[in-house]
């Protein structure tokens, strides 16, 4: 991927829209939308005060860890859906899109240098352990996906792209 493709706001906006659509189709869906188990996902709440004061490397750690855990969670959701007796087609479609979207975002972040940022000392050592919550429905899983993109990921890319502009 081109190194700064993710710095084009329309790129992230596309994935955000997909995540929002996925969240919307699961609104009011009970029968097909239970995960039947608790899946660990990143806590997407952002402490804006603390975030702004973090070094970009520390932000990268949080984003990279969160993205990894979220990808794992969505893959688990996909596996549960595949193994269910009658997977609901619209849900299947959006889960597949989310898996593909998270893969692409991982590639785009790697191209931006987020992985390098995340493992460079001293930031990696001082990063707080990733806060997590659990999701027991696809709605909550998609909500976490959407909030993660709107929150930490967007804040990080904004700062990383701005820093890279100088």
């Amino acid at each position: 991927a081109p190194p700064r493709l993710i710095c084009d706001s329309r790129v992230l906006e596309r994935y955000l829209l997909e995540a929002k659509e996925a969240e919307n189709i699961t609104t009011g869906c009970a029968e097909h939308c239970s995960l039947n188990e608790n899946i660990t996902v990143p806590d997407t709440k952002v402490n804006f005060y603390a975030w702004k004061r973090m070094e970009v490397g520390q932000q990268a750690v949080e984003v990279w860890q969160g993205l990894a855990l979220l990808s794992e969670a969505v893959l688990r959701g996909q596996a549960l859906l595949v193994n269910s007796s009658q997977p609901w087609e619209p849900l299947q479609l959006h889960v597949d899109k989310a898996v593909s979207g998270l893969r692409s975002l991982t590639t785009l972040l790697r191209a931006l240098g987020a992985q390098k940022e995340a493992i460079s000392p001293p930031d990696a050592a001082s990063a707080a352990p990733l806060r997590t919550i659990t999701a027991d429905t696809f709605r909550k899983l998609f909500r976490v996906y959407s909030n993660f993109l709107r929150g930490k990921l967007k804040l990080y890319t904004g700062e990383a792209c701005r820093t890279g502009d100088r």
């Epitope: 402490n47 702004k52 701005r162």
Partner: antibody
Framework: QVQLVQSGAEVKKPGASVKVSCKAS????????MSWVRQAPGQGLEWMGW????????NYAQKFQGRVTMTRDTSISTAYMELSRLRSEDTAVYYC?????????WGQGTLVTVSS | SYELTQPLSVSVALGQTARITCSGD??????VYWYQQKPGQAPVLVIY???KRPSGIPERFSGSNSGNTATLTISRAQAGDEADYYC???????????FGGGTKLTVL
């Protein structure tokens, strides 16, 4: 002790500009973002924008974009907020507020009156 | 842009429990901050990160947040609690802070 001391009250005519200062003491000025919040008489708090004193980068509330400019002078640990094209609705107390884990330290406020 | 809605006023009998609400779209997914402001004074924070109290704030003050509503609870209300209370969070779409309209608490 840690404190923020703001400049005195101002009376301005509509269409003019006002520049309010906020002098920080008792802490490292460049280590904390600074926000500006205003409060019209009998009204609620309204966030205007923030400045990062270390880098000088800013972010303004949509409502004030194009009219507000936040700057700083690190040599004298002072933040400034300038509001242009004043109108009567801009009559308010303007506060600077340090961002710690929240808005932890506030200035005493500067009353800006816009009147013809 | 993101909006936070508070009731204009809340009344509570002395010694009873007051609850002040702050509504916003999916506010349960955000941290919420509560400020107390007395006439002629700058605001003072009473709750941060949704449910934490800074030192010096009595245990009577507590916060919670779920769904579309955050709540500031003041138990055993005292005359000195009379003030305006503001909730605050942020708009992630614009990276900006947002205050609620404020609630005037009256202790009867």
């Amino acid at each position: 002790q840690v404190q923020l001391v703001q400049s005195g009250a101002e009376v301005k005519k509509p269409g003019a500009s006002v520049k309010v200062s906020c002098k920080a003491s008792g802490y490292t000025f460049t280590s904390y973002y600074m926000s500006w919040v205003r409060q019209a008489p009998g009204q609620g708090l309204e966030w205007m924008g923030w400045i990062n004193p270390l880098k000088g980068n800013t972010n303004y509330a949509q409502k004030f974009q194009g009219r507000v400019t936040m700057t700083r002078d690190t040599s004298i640990s002072t933040a400034y907020m300038e509001l242009s094209r004043l109108r009567s609705e801009d009559t308010a107390v303007y506060y600077c507020a340090r961002e710690g884990m929240y808005f932890d330290i506030w200035g005493q406020g500067t009353l800006v009156t816009v009147s013809s | 842009s993101y909006e936070l809605t508070q009731p204009l006023s809340v009344s509570v009998a002395l010694g009873q429990t007051a609850r002040i609400t702050c509504s916003g779209d999916s506010i349960g997914d955000k941290y919420v901050y509560w400020y107390q402001q007395k006439p002629g004074q700058a605001p003072v924070l009473v709750i941060y990160d949704t449910n934490k109290r800074p030192s010096g704030i009595p245990e009577r003050f507590s916060g919670s947040n779920s769904g579309n509503t955050a709540t500031l609870t003041i138990s055993r209300a005292q005359a000195g609690d009379e003030a305006d209370y503001y909730c605050q969070s942020w708009d992630l779409d614009f990276n900006t802070y947002v205050f609620g309209g404020g609630t005037k608490l009256t202790v009867l």
